[in-house]
């Protein structure tokens, strides 16, 4: 093993980490779990503990980024450099960055969670054997109802374990049809559709009607994404494999390497490659986020690369399902932090539960009862010509959290985000929010749980704004944005989808700027944002101090309240009023005392 010069290390043992944003390659819960397990490798052999927090002053900030992403070490596109980490220390030191141009998996292909079947929601196992053939994506083979399924073990023929893959024929997400499956064909604007479509939408999300006639019933849902068959490269990147497809007159119901000399798997994205010539590469095994994270966290704790090829800290990625830590890794980390004080826990013994009823040879259909829980995240209804979102929710039945001193908004030093929603001021902090209406003797109401009202959101928000016309709520956290229309949500989406470059680490605020337009802020910069198109005008980039002279340059939140702009720094705000095109600071005050009218005791 090697350590950094001078045995660079953390000088406290309770290390905190913040997952600033996410990759879209894996479900959030899987990412959270991969990072937690990676930290657990190191805490199992040292006195270190790792606690997840939701603020940027964490010791280890974890970020997904592409190319230039805000440090001096740009990523390099797919493959090559997978991630990087800084050695222990303040600021960016200790942080770990992951290249989101990689396909992140658990090392064995895309992670596709299943529903129904007999595998209790286990993820697909790619490749898997069915009737002697190998499948690297979900398939409809062996079924007459067109539902895609997969084996959750390497061999369906011997193990009989399966589940259904995300499919619009099984369920839809969000929309206004309570998750009902698509109805094909369906009528939209007088035209017949026999597959999901993006027509009527500007955001590229695929949707369908859940009755035979959208024009009449206005019921719709969003089609689940199929990570297992979303192609890369070729001439159809981002589109789905179509199975079966015809290639050189022969039919293929799984990805194939036929016609290639390099063995790479590909598929057609229409039913006939011979006539349409549309194709892309099938997802590869991807890189294990768990293993790469474990290696990067080794760096973040003070370990340099090892010269032992079997060690986790060896500088080359190698997928393994065995215990990742080598004796050399353990020696290295203990050289820095010492051994774990108490005896190392023995792994629990587990028994594999047996299915209660013997499954049939071929996957059976899903139960008739659909799952009661709706997905919490997903896009809202298509704008303009397309289906509209459901009506906005009525009075919320938000849970009030048991009160403690910190739950009084007046005791909050710095709020994560503040926004005027409706005619009330909403103040967000660490998974909670308060509501405030101006008036003599009025006090903030709450706290309420963000998760109750907006379940898709993370605990830590950077900024929030409401677009008055559409009543859309925009929530920003790290490099991601969620857009709520009533109870339905679009997102999370990456900031690049709004036209903000990889150098924009977060959106720190927003102000109205004319009909359907906003100003988005990030640190010292701002952009004009078209709410309908959900896109910034890249030519509109400007420096904050040019447009708003006199406000601090390191504001952490910008919001609009009572037609004035507020720039927050620490516990203070700078209020800006606009008179005859001039923006002037007309007040500096405390958020708590001067806006929330808290008593100064």
């Amino acid at each position: 093993f090697q350590t950094f010069e001078g045995d660079l290390k953390w000088h406290h043992h309770n290390i905190t980490y913040w997952i600033q944003n996410y990759s879209e390659d894996l479900p959030r819960a899987v990412i959270d779990d991969a990072f937690a397990r990676a930290f657990a490798l190191w805490s199992a052999v040292t006195p270190l503990t790792f606690t997840r927090v939701y603020s940027r002053d964490a010791d280890i900030v974890i970020q997904f980024g592409v190319a230039e992403h805000g440090d001096g070490y740009p990523f390099d596109g797919k493959d090559g450099l997978l991630a990087h980490a800084f050695p222990p220390g303040p600021g960016i030191q200790g942080d770990a960055h992951f290249d989101d141009d990689e396909l992140w998996s658990l090392g064995k292909g895309v992670v596709v969670p299943t529903r129904f079947g007999n595998a209790d929601g286990a993820a697909c196992h790619f490749p898997f054997i069915f009737e002697g053939r190998s499948y690297s994506a979900c398939t409809t083979d062996g079924r007459s109802d067109g539902l895609p399924w997969c084996s959750t073990t390497a061999n369906y023929d011997t193990d009989d374990r399966f589940g259904f893959c995300p499919s619009e024929r099984l369920y839809t997400q969000d929309g206004n049809a309570d998750g009902k499956p698509c109805q094909f064909p369906f009528i939209f604007q007088g035209q017949s559709y026999s597959a999901c479509t993006t027509d009527g939408r500007s955001d590229g999300y695929r949707w369908c009607a859940t009755t035979a006639n959208y024009d009449r019933d206005k019921l719709f849902g969003f089609c689940p994404t199929r990570a297992d068959s979303t192609v890369m490269g070729g001439n159809s990147a981002g589109e789905l494999c179509v199975f079966p497809f015809t290639f050189l007159g022969k039919e293929y119901s799984t990805c194939t390497s036929e016609g290639r000399g390099d063995g790479r798997l590909w598929c057609a994205t229409t039913s006939n490659f011979d006539s349409d010539k549309k194709w892309g590469f099938c997802p590869d095994q991807g890189y294990s986020l768990f293993l790469v994270a474990a290696h990067e966290f080794g760096h973040a704790l003070g370990l340099d690369h090892s010269s032992v090829p079997e060690a986790l800290m060896y500088p080359m990625y190698r997928f393994t399902e065995g215990p990742p830590l080598h004796k050399d890794d353990v020696n290295g980390i203990r050289h820095l932090y010492g051994p774990r004080p108490e005896p190392e826990p023995r792994p629990p013994t587990t028994t594999t539960p047996q299915p209660t009823a013997p499954p049939t040879v071929c996957p059976t259909g899903p139960p008739t009862v659909h799952p009661s829980e709706r997905p919490t995240a997903g896009p809202t209804g298509p704008p303009s010509a397309g289906p509209t979102g459901p009506p906005t929710a009525g009075p919320s039945t938000a849970t009030t959290v048991p009160l403690s001193p910190v739950d009084d908004a007046c005791n909050v030093n710095i709020f994560d985000a503040i926004a005027e929603i409706g005619n009330q001021l909403y103040l967000f902090k660490d998974g909670k929010y308060w509501r405030f209406s101006e008036g003599r003797g009025s006090r903030p109401q709450g706290p309420f749980l963000i998760a109750d009202k907006w379940p898709a959101l993370p605990r830590k928000l950077d900024s929030v704004f409401e677009e008055r016309l559409s009543k859309k709520l925009f929530f920003f956290s790290g490099r991601q944005v969620w857009v709520y229309t009533g109870a339905s949500v679009l997102g999370p989406r990456r900031l690049d989808k709004l036209g903000l470059g990889a150098d924009v680490a977060q959106v720190t605020g927003a102000l109205r700027s004319g009909r359907g337009k906003m100003l988005l802020f990030s640190g010292r910069r701002l952009w004009r944002f078209d709410v309908k198109a959900q896109m910034v005008d890249p030519r509109s980039a400007s420096e904050v101090d040019r447009m708003f002279p006199g406000v601090p340059l390191d504001t952490h939140d910008v919001f609009q309240y009572r037609e004035k702009a507020y720039f927050c720094q620490d516990r203070f705000y700078w209020r800006v009023s606009s008179r005859s095109e001039l923006n002037q600071v007309d007040q500096v005050g405390y958020v708590t005392y001067d806006i929330l009218q808290c008593p100064e005791d």
Partner: antibody, heavy 124, light 107 residues
Framework: EVQLLESGGGLVQPGGSLRLSCAAS???????DMWWVRQAPGKGLEWVS?????????FYADSVKGRFTISRDNSKNTLYLQMNSLRAEDTAVYYC?????????????????WGQGTLVTVSS | DIQMTQSPATLSLSPGERATLSCRAS??????LAWYQQKPGQAPRLLIY???YRATGIPARFSGSGSGTDFTLTISSLEPEDYAVYYC?????????FGQGTRLEIK
């Protein structure tokens, strides 16, 4: 002992081309990012280009983008800089330099070994 | 791009004296700063990396300090071989940039 040896410099007319090479020895070449840095006569240092260890990523200073191409042959432990459409302002001593850090550990900022430099003169 | 400003442009000191060279970044670069020494007709030589770590073979009279935007290279007692041009270089943000250099000359 680590050594970097540049070659390929010389006098060339504006609009012309030149290919610089840098032969490396004494370290595991394929593990390290490699850089070209130049210095105009009597002036300071200016980075030109970098290529990552795998050769999978290359980056260029705005002043040379679209005209220069960096490449490497890890089997030959050699770094290259193909310079096309040369201009008078490209006149400089060109150094190849080895990054002190490697791979995914991004702390040790600095170029710990430099070649002796090769002079490129662009003049008619 | 981040601008690196070195001061003074020229520093005239006698052998045995203490030399203090300054480098300022136009925005915070954490500790991602290196110092190089260059003598006439020679390639630059790495002295300090990550603001304060001495490179292999560099005498203890050379030390670096600072973080954020302000950095200092100190030569505690000048030797005749120390007279040269000194450059700072940042990698706190992309792309990397160099300072314009400080010439250290014999008084």
């Amino acid at each position: 002992e680590v050594q970097l040896l540049e070659s390929g410099g010389g006098l060339v007319q504006p609009g012309g081309s030149l290919r610089l090479s840098c032969a490396a020895s004494g370290f595991t070449f394929s593990w390290y990012d490699m850089w070209w840095v130049r210095q105009a006569p009597g002036k300071g240092l200016e980075w030109v280009s970098v290529i990552y260890s795998s050769g999978g990523a290359t980056f260029y200073a705005d002043s040379v983008k679209g005209r220069f191409t960096i490449s490497r042959d890890n089997s030959k432990n050699t770094l290259y800089l193909q310079m096309n459409s040369l201009r008078a302002e490209d006149t400089a001593v060109y150094y190849c330099a080895k990054d002190r850090a490697y791979g995914d550990y991004v702390g040790w900022n600095g170029f710990d070994y430099w070649g002796q430099g090769t002079l490129v003169t662009v003049s008619s | 791009d981040i601008q690196m400003t070195q001061s003074p442009a020229t520093l005239s000191l006698s052998p045995g004296e203490r030399a203090t060279l300054s480098c300022r970044a136009s925005q915070s670069i954490s500790s991602f700063l290196a110092w190089y020494q260059q003598k006439p007709g020679q390639a630059p030589r790495l002295l300090i990396y990550d603001a304060s770590y001495r490179a292999t073979g560099i005498p203890a009279r050379f030390s670096g300090s600072g973080s954020g935007t302000d950095f200092t290279l100190t030569i505690s007692s000048l030797e005749p071989e120390d007279y040269a041009v000194y450059y700072c270089q940042q990698r706190g943000n992309w792309p990397i940039t160099f300072g314009q250099g400080t010439r250290l000359e014999i008084k």
